[in-house]
């Protein structure tokens, strides 16, 4: 499992397959934010999930999103994106039983009910970036990023990894 | 396969310049942050600089003892990372090793042979 | 900086031994739940190779024997089952933050 403080250890037998092992190997609970500190909120409507960026008011409670990490083995001669080894990929569950989803079509990420497995639109590669932020790019379709659009999220398509550092990809993991 | 080949390696006299190249072949090379790292002989290992990805241009973080005196570089077109080396001391002489972070940028993931660069009159 | 203070720094073992190496950090390495703990494997003349990455993970091609554990400041590299191709020296190192630095080694030597 990977080191992790404060939070449910997994200790599994890890295979060669594309994402390694079905369980994850290690779970964090966290807030997540903008790169400008806004918050990542969900609010059930109507029987179903909206997801929302918005500035809270102070000592406003934040919400938390259960990352499941994942280890991926990423052979270049299969995927053909010129990326290989190994690399972190991660599930994001507001609440029991909802995963974050990339919905390529639409360019919208949704909260979907669905029992485990899980399909490969709930996976993305996790970044580590600078200024202590991460971004999280579809596995699904490489180069396709969660991101921040008119105070929602939705899947953004860098063009260059220069431009992989835009602020609207990155985003803040905090306990608090 | 994926290589990352370094030369320019060599004698050099105190005071004096090098510039380390290294070739990196069997991955797209533009989606990994690169880093130098050098071992003196006989000694541990020492991250000496990082060349990362950014919006507007590359973010360069280096090791106190080589700040202002070093300089690291990338050309994605040329699939190659660098190493300006100005203002030589005898405590440079190490093997240089260029290394590719694991994509997603975690850890250490690819390492090349190294070049030897030793300083001295 | 974040200091890495590895022991021992130096071991005589024999085939079939059981190894184990610790690394401390001077501070937390930990962030987004993960351990930025990594251990390499360097024979003489060649270059380090990545054993294990956030504390526990195997890098590619690792043989099972090699395992990672701990969390924070305190990490463990064992080695259940020493082999002649074992013998080298190992070395820990965080990716936390720059300046990533290394621990000062620990040669594994034959008894």
């Known amino acids: 499992a990977f080191g992790i403080s404060g939070v449910q250890k997994y200790t599994r037998a890890l295979h060669d397959s594309s994402i390694t092992g079905i369980s994850p190997i290690t779970e964090y609970l966290a807030s997540l934010s903008t790169y400008n500190d806004q918050s990542i909120t969900f609010a059930l409507e109507d029987e179903s999930y909206e997801i929302y960026v918005e500035d809270l008011k102070k000592d406003e409670k934040k919400d938390k999103v259960l990352l499941s990490y994942y280890e991926s083995q990423h052979p270049s001669n299969e995927s053909g994106d010129g990326v290989d080894g190994k690399m972190l990929m991660v599930t994001l569950s507001p609440t029991k039983d909802f995963w974050l989803h990339a919905n390529n079509k639409e360019h919208s990420v949704e909260l979907h009910k669905c029992e485990k497995p899980l399909p490969d639109q709930a996976f993305f590669v996790l970044h580590n970036m600078h200024s202590n932020c991460v971004s999280f790019e579809c596995k699904t379709d490489p180069g396709v990023f969660i991101g921040v659009k008119d105070n929602h999220l939705a899947l953004i398509k860098v063009d260059s990894s220069e431009n992989l550092c835009t602020e609207n990809i990155l985003f803040k993991l905090s306990e608090t | 396969e994926v290589q990352l080949v370094e030369s320019g390696g060599g004698l050099v006299q105190p005071g004096g310049s090098l510039r380390l190249s290294c070739a990196a072949s069997?991955?797209?090379?533009?989606?990994?942050?690169m880093n130098w790292v050098r071992q003196a002989p006989g000694k541990g290992l020492e991250w000496v600089a990082e060349?990362?990805?950014?919006?507007?241009?590359?973010?360069?973080d280096y090791a106190e003892s080589v700040k202002g005196r070093f300089t690291i570089s990338r050309d994605n077109a040329k699939n190659s990372v660098y190493l300006q080396m100005n203002s030589l001391r005898a405590e440079d002489t190490a093997v240089y090793y260029c290394i590719r972070r694991n994509y997603g940028n975690w850890f250490f993931e690819i390492w090349g042979q190294g070049t030897l660069v030793t300083v001295s009159s | 900086d974040i200091q890495m203070t590895q022991s021992p720094s130096s071991l005589s073992a024999s085939v079939g031994d059981r190894v184990t190496i610790t690394c401390r950090a001077s501070?937390?390495?930990?962030?987004?739940?993960?351990?930025?703990m990594n251990w390499f494997q360097q024979k003489p003349g060649k270059a380090p190779k990545l054993l294990i990455y956030?504390?526990?993970n195997q890098g590619s091609g690792v043989p099972s024997r090699f395992s990672g554990s701990g969390s924070g400041t305190d990490f463990t590299l064992t080695i259940s089952s020493l082999q002649p191709e074992d013998f080298a020296t190992y070395y820990c190192q965080h990716s936390k933050e720059v300046p990533y630095t290394f621990g000062q080694g620990t040669k594994v030597e034959i008894k």
């Open positions: 060349i990362r990805l950014n919006a507007i241009n590359y973010v360069k």
């Open positions: 501070e937390s390495v930990d962030r987004y739940g993960i351990s930025f």
């Open positions: 956030a504390a526990s």
């Open positions: 069997g991955f797209t090379f533009n989606k990994f942050w």
